[in-house]
Interface confidence: medium
Amino acid sequence: APRGTQAEESPFVGNPGNITGARGLTGTLRCQLQVQGEPPEVHWLRDGQILELADSTQTQVPLGEDEQDDWIVVSQLRITSLQLSDTGQYQCLVFLGHQTFVSQPGYVGLEGLPYFLEEPEDRTVAANTPFNLSCQAQGPPEPVDLLWLQDAVPLATAPGHGPQRSLHVPGLNKTSSFSCEAHNAKGVTTSRTATITVLPQQPRNLHLVSRQPTELEVAWTPGLSGIYPLTHCTLQAVLSDDGMGIQAGEPDPPEEPLTSQASVPPHQLRLGSLHPHTPYHIRVACTSSQGPSSWTHWLPVETPEGVPLGPPENISATRNGSQAFVHWQEPRAPLQGTLLGYRLAYQGQDTPEVLMDIGLRQEVTLELQGDGSVSNLTVCVAAYTAAGDGPWSLPVPLEAWRPGQAQPVHQLVKEPSTPAFSWPWW
């Protein structure tokens, strides 16, 4: 017969039946054919496509003594644990010479209690904040109607009357449970129960109240927490490394943050033991019995500069005639800011104090007034930052210069500027 048609009589004497059942069902489809000569391999088709991995068995029974006599061939296709993907039209197929024969079709259908494709999931939500829950079920048979329940109480008068696939909850003030029921002609299936835990809302308006070189006082406005009072708030501070790049909503900073807990109220906390003149990022979260809120975004803050905590070190002052050479080293104590320079004061026993701003140099040559006969001349030095002067050094007496002692040439200060303010002399 031309073109692989079934012009010759079909060899099939038994065709697949129909199977309709619930998910998980196990069933068998069977077809039978009678052929002359060598029995062919029977292939199974679903929706016109050969099943490559079919769980099929083939039995062949000769009807005579001779190889060329007729054979009865029976093929059985086993369907284990029926799923939606198994449904469709089934046929047997054989190749006989250059011809292709297919059996009459049988059908596999699915019918039973609704099956959930999606169920509500446990989640946490901020108090009084809207959220959605999802539930999706299918038959067959269709239609499948959903009924949502909150704390075991139906949210609609009947299945299919309320929200279906998505439930919009405008907000909760207490931890609640949600589930959905799927109804079809075969009955009802109930989904898992999802617990929705109500956490405090994220605090708002985190801001600085006051700043000291080594401490910051911060305050914030708590968010709503439903029926659960806040137990405490947690504040984190982290050094703002230049390379850290903490942005709003970015992942946590790489180093371990400084963490402090605040009893509430008041919604305020003094953060101590900080570095002066240092940028930090801070954030806050508040906790109830149900758990913590989300963190606020990182807020950039900075401790102010302080004054140096100690005087310059190793001050030496030597005198040679009408000139005095003074030099010193940077304070060993913390500067608490950016060093802007040094102030120097000198005074004789019966002469007024002379005050000078030296800048960042650590040495100076003074041109003394008069013939150099001023007695008991002493010098004091203090370092200063933008926040002000640090402590003055103890007075250092001017020592007479001894021959052989090195004395580098320095810029002479002939006319020290008169300060606009006076400095106490110890």
């Epitope: 292939h43 088709l45 016109g48 050969i50 490559e52 469709g88 190749f95 292709t100 297919v102």
Partner: antibody, heavy 118, light 112 residues
Framework: QVQLQQPGTELVKPGASVKLSCKAS????????INWVKQRPGQGLEWIGN????????NYNEKFKNKATLTVDKSSSTAYMHLSSLTSEDSAVYYC???????????WGQGTTLTVSS | DIVMSQSPSSLAVSAGEKVTMSCKSS????????????LAWYQQKPGQSPKLLIY???TRESGVPARFTGSGSGTDFTLTISSVQAEDLAIYYC????????FGGGTKLEIR
């Protein structure tokens, strides 16, 4: 005797859509895949997609996913291809082809010549 | 997706000569279940629908002259015309032929 009947010509304006038909006879319509093939003038053959009338299962060539929609009407044993947002690029001969199992022989319709012109 | 490559794209021969044309697929067309290669060869004459010549890589369609022979398995296939006739002037296409189809670009046969 297997037959696939297609209208000879269709003339439509750019931007419009068209529904090409393919009426099957001489076999059990729900048992065999119907394929659609495009051939532009002087060009080769391009497979568009196919549909199995028994279950409405269908497959598409990625290139035609947003252009062609395949449907069947079992009661009249007719397969349809809906082509949308037509342009001159869609002017071609469109064949419907019945696919036999396992890559064995197939049957071709005579083709519909679609002309998209204003 | 399976890609089908045909060569040559065209060839011109005199009547009576033997012709071979090649079709390569990007993956094997041999179905392990049915042990058949899902490859078909078509002939399309000017103004006509494609006509099936060979299916299952080597099975000649009923009514097709014996001078047309298909061979090959897996990824490499050949169509041979043992003695070309004037009426063989056409474009020849190979096709991966199971469920999702892919056609080769065609080989145009001209008679000198």
């Amino acid at each position: 005797q297997v037959q696939l009947q297609q209208p000879g010509t269709e003339l439509v304006k750019p931007g419009a859509s068209v529904k090409l038909s393919c009426k099957a006879s001489g076999y059990i319509f729900t048992n065999f895949w119907i394929n659609w093939v495009k051939q532009r003038p002087g060009q080769g053959l391009e497979w568009i997609g196919n549909i199995f009338p028994g279950s409405n299962s269908s497959n598409y060539n990625e290139k035609f996913k947003n252009k062609a929609t395949l449907t069947v009407d079992k009661s009249s044993s007719t397969a349809y291809m809906h082509l949308s947002s037509l342009t001159s690029e869609d002017s071609a001969v469109y064949y419907c082809v019945r696919d036999y199992y396992g890559g064995s022989p197939d049957y071709w319709g005579q083709g519909t010549t679609l002309t998209v012109s204003s | 997706d399976i890609v089908m490559s045909q060569s040559p794209s065209s060839l011109a021969v005199s009547a009576g000569e033997k012709v071979t044309m090649s079709c390569k697929s990007s993956q094997s067309l041999l179905n392990s279940k049915t042990r058949k290669n899902y490859l078909a060869w078509y002939q399309q004459k000017p103004g006509q629908s494609p006509k099936l010549l060979i299916y299952w890589a080597s099975t000649r369609e009923s009514g097709v002259p014996a001078r047309f022979t298909g061979s090959g398995s897996g990824t490499d296939f050949t169509l041979t015309i043992s003695s070309v006739q004037a009426e063989d002037l056409a474009i020849y296409y190979c096709k991966h032929s199971y469920n999702l189809w892919t056609f080769g670009g065609g080989t145009k046969l001209e008679i000198r």
